[in-house]
């Protein structure tokens, strides 16, 4: 045809895919009746007629357009729905009259691609690696045309480098025309590449302009061979016995090798291995002293069988020894002197303290206490505590007792107790002293005695309420080698009209079932006993 | 076409050390990872060691004291040994061709019963 | 390790039928995830890999779907060919692979 050659560039359309193309034939009226055009498509240089427009009045021909072809703007626009790659071709219009003159249009088709599936190499990277190997892949599904990729490494982009980073990027057509994109990152990495961050980014077009998509970002797991092993202890500080202490073994290298924990023998100077759990960690629950001493890691790389060895480490577990306490069993006549002495040793300096044991009162700060002009009140326990002010929790202690000579003392000398006939009332009598004394009661019932400390003694009796009981009452006496004593309890009878005993009569530590009232230091325990068997 | 195809002894005495084979066709080994997988009867799928195209070896920590992966190029061969086999190493074992992560072809298995 | 659970073990279904197999992930692998069809004699075939991309030369009867932790497999019209047992494997952290659904006709 001649003049082909001057033909000018083709009109250009863009548009996404799924979208409609409005093809808008540019022929001016000089050059032909827009009433009687017919539109061609061009694929691969052959022409195929796809509209004719008759007076004004469009027909699809058969075909692939048949379905998505009309006309719009009175005729001078055609329109394309649903447009998908296969339809990136030129389109032309030719008028027919008053000569043949044709107008040709370039549409481009354009789809953002899906998000890019960013995946990392799920074995890992070795560093010591003889070639690059796949770190990474990109893929990015369902874009036209295809788009491009560029891979970035702590916000950097990748370039090649021969022999270190390799791109290798294809791509597959999907049966809708579409592009998917599949990028490999291939790499030789290093030790710092471990916290390094990768993604990619997809650039493509649209009819709007350029744009782009990030993956999310991804680390890859990198192993290299261990340099350095070192022990680690927990809780960091000083430790104490009772502590739960853990050593573990840590290496710089990944993945970690295969660890065992030594400990020096005092004696041998030998080094021993110890049994650690699963974790490879030593626990020591609880630590004791004898755990102290020289500890050392040994970490053996199973791939290359090459060992590396920890610094040694000085493990203190700080101890408080057994208290002793001299004299360990002290008695003294009343009015005399008694030094008492606290030892004890320990790995860090120790203070002494002297407590009262019934009060906790603080008596002395030191290892020594010295008591004069003793009183019958002064027996009884003295606790030293030895402990170190560095280490809280760390002490131990040890309770002596004093025993003042002197015969019985009563809790109480006499008391009232209300009472029911025929219940069983439980009484108690309480006596100090040294010798620490016995006690015996006046009248026939079931008696249990306590001793409550060396000095101490507590009984009980159990008796039925009888009316010649009620008469006599009940006495219990204390008795040692230096005398004896006594207490009396007065029993009187519950009356429904009294309301309440006489408040000072319920003073002391004797207890009843009698009274339907609480009092202090006292227990109440009733029970009915059966009725006699009547004889004929 | 992309062809794996396992070879090895079906019979193995407890004890002894496995040697297993995988000849490959339709690509090359620098090319593509390959991994060997293991079935026991009546049970899943358990990966057990791979190489990777670049000739990195990996290996499931349960089994890496007593295996070993090689592979040899120009033969499109990967080699795998496993020593010190017990009972429970009876199974189906195949190998299988990395894209670049996921397997794409396998071979068909090679049934391996060990004998106490 | 990454665990992988599928469910159920055991799937009863009539030529025709659609049908979905589960399987979940015990953290997020993301879409690092295939599909598998086991035969006995057979080669292990892929069906779907990247949780949703279909092998090619598999029909597309068989789609898959999921991302993160939850996973399915679905045949839109079950064929006397898909009897067989299915695998889904995890490609994210190492490599694990589900117990396995054995697929049955009714």
């Known amino acids: 045809v001649p003049g082909e050659a001057e033909q000018p560039a083709p009109e250009l359309v863009e548009v996404e895919v799924g979208s409609t193309a409005l093809l808008k034939c540019g022929l001016s009226q000089s050059q032909g009746n827009l009433s009687h055009v017919d539109w061609f498509s061009v694929h691969k240089e052959k022409r195929t007629l796809i509209f004719r427009v008759r007076q004004g009045q469009g027909q699809s021909e058969p075909g692939e357009y048949e379905q998505r072809l009309s006309l719009q703007d009175r005729g001078a626009t055609l329109a394309l729905t649903q447009v998908t790659p296969q339809d990136e071709r030129i389109f032309l219009c030719q008028g027919k009259r008053p000569r043949s003159q044709e107008y040709r249009i370039q549409l481009r088709v354009y789809k953002a691609p899906e998000e890019p599936n960013i995946q990392v190499n799920p074995l890992g990277i070795p560093v010591n690696s003889k070639e690059p190997e796949e770190v990474a892949t990109c893929v990015g599904r369902n874009g036209y045309p295809i788009p491009q990729v560029i891979w970035y490494k702590n916000g950097r982009p990748l370039k090649e480098e021969k022999n270190r980073v390799h791109i290798q990027s294809s791509q597959t057509v999907e049966s809708s025309g579409l592009y998917t994109l599949q990028s490999i990152l291939k790499a030789q990495l290093v030790k710092e590449d471990k916290d390094a961050q990768f993604y990619c980014e997809l650039n493509y077009r649209l009819p709007s302009g350029n744009h782009m998509k990030e993956s999310r970002e991804v680390t890859v797991p990198v192993f290299y061979p261990t340099e350095k092993v070192w022990l680690e202890v927990e809780p960091v500080g000083m430790l104490k016995e009772g502590d739960r202490v853990e050593i573990r073994c840590l290496a710089d290298g990944n993945p970690p090798p295969h660890f065992s924990i030594s400990k020096q023998n005092p004696s041998t100077r030998e080094a021993e291995e110890e049994t650690t759990n699963d974790n490879g960690v030593l626990v020591l629950e609880p630590a004791r002293k004898e755990h102290s001493g020289r500890y050392e890691c040994q970490g053996l790389d199973l791939d290359t069988m090459i060992s590396l060895l920890s610094e040694p480490q000085e493990l203190l577990v700080n101890y408080v020894s057994d208290v002793r306490v001299s004299p360990a069993a002290p008695e003294r006549q009343e009015g005399s002197s008694l030094t008492l002495t606290c030892e004890a040793e320990s790995s860090q300096d120790l203070e002494f303290q002297w407590l009262r044991e019934e009060t906790g009162q603080v008596l002395e700060r030191g290892p020594v206490l010295q008591l004069h002009d003793l009183k019958r009140e002064a027996g009884g326990g003295y606790r030293c505590v030895a402990s170190v002010p560095s280490i809280p929790g760390l002490n131990r202690t040890q309770l002596v007792n004093v025993a003042i000579f002197g015969p019985p003392w009563m809790a109480f000398k006499e008391r009232k107790v209300w009472v029911k006939e025929n219940m069983v009332l439980n009484l108690s009598c309480e006596a100090s002293g040294h010798p620490r004394p016995t006690i015996s009661w006046n009248v026939n019932g079931t008696a249990s005695e306590q001793d409550q400390d060396p000095q101490r003694v507590l009984s009980t009796l159990n008796v039925l309420v009888t009316p010649e009981l009620l008469e006599t009452g009940v006495e219990c006496t204390a008795s040692n080698d230096l005398g004896k004593n006594t207490s009396i309890l007065f029993l009187e009878l519950v009356n429904l009209t009294t309301l309440t005993p006489d408040s000072n009569t319920t003073t002391g530590l004797s207890t009843s079932t009698a009274s339907p009232h609480t009092r202090a230091n006292s227990t109440s325990t009733e029970r009915k006993l059966p009725e006699p068997e009547s004889r004929g | 076409q992309v062809q794996l195809k396992e070879s090895g002894p079906g019979l193995v005495q407890s004890s002894q050390t496995l040697s297993l084979t995988c000849t490959v066709s339709?690509?090359?080994?620098?090319?593509?990872?390959v991994s060997w997988v293991r079935q026991p009867p009546g049970k899943g799928l358990e990966w057990i060691a791979a190489?990777?195209?670049?000739?990195?070896?990996y290996y499931n920590s349960a089994f890496k004291s007593r295996l070993s992966i090689s592979r040899n190029t120009s033969k499109s061969q990967v080699l795998l040994k496993m020593n010190s086999l017990q009972t429970e190493d009876t199974g189906m074992y195949f190998c299988?061709?990395?894209?670049?992560?996921?397997?794409?072809?396998w071979g068909q298995g090679v049934m391996v019963t060990v004998s106490s | 390790d990454i665990q992988v659970t599928q469910s159920p073990s055991l799937l009863s279904a009539s030529v025709g039928d659609r049908v979905t197999l589960n399987c979940k992930g015990s953290q997020n692998i993301y879409k690092s995830l295939a599909w598998f069809r086991l035969k006995r004699g057979e080669a292990p075939k892929l069906l779907i890999y990247d949780a949703n991309s279909l092998q090619t030369g598999i029909p597309s009867r068989f789609s898959g779907s999921g991302s993160g932790t939850d996973f399915t497999l679905t045949i839109t019209s079950l064929q006397p060919e898909d009897v067989a047992t299915y695998f889904c494997q995890q490609y994210y952290s190492g490599y694990t692979f589900g117990a396995g659904t054995k697929l049955e006709l009714k």
């Open positions: 190489i990777s195209s670049g000739g990195s070896t």
């Open positions: 339709g690509f090359s080994l620098t090319s593509n990872g």
């Open positions: 299988a061709r990395h894209r670049p992560f996921y397997f794409d072809y």
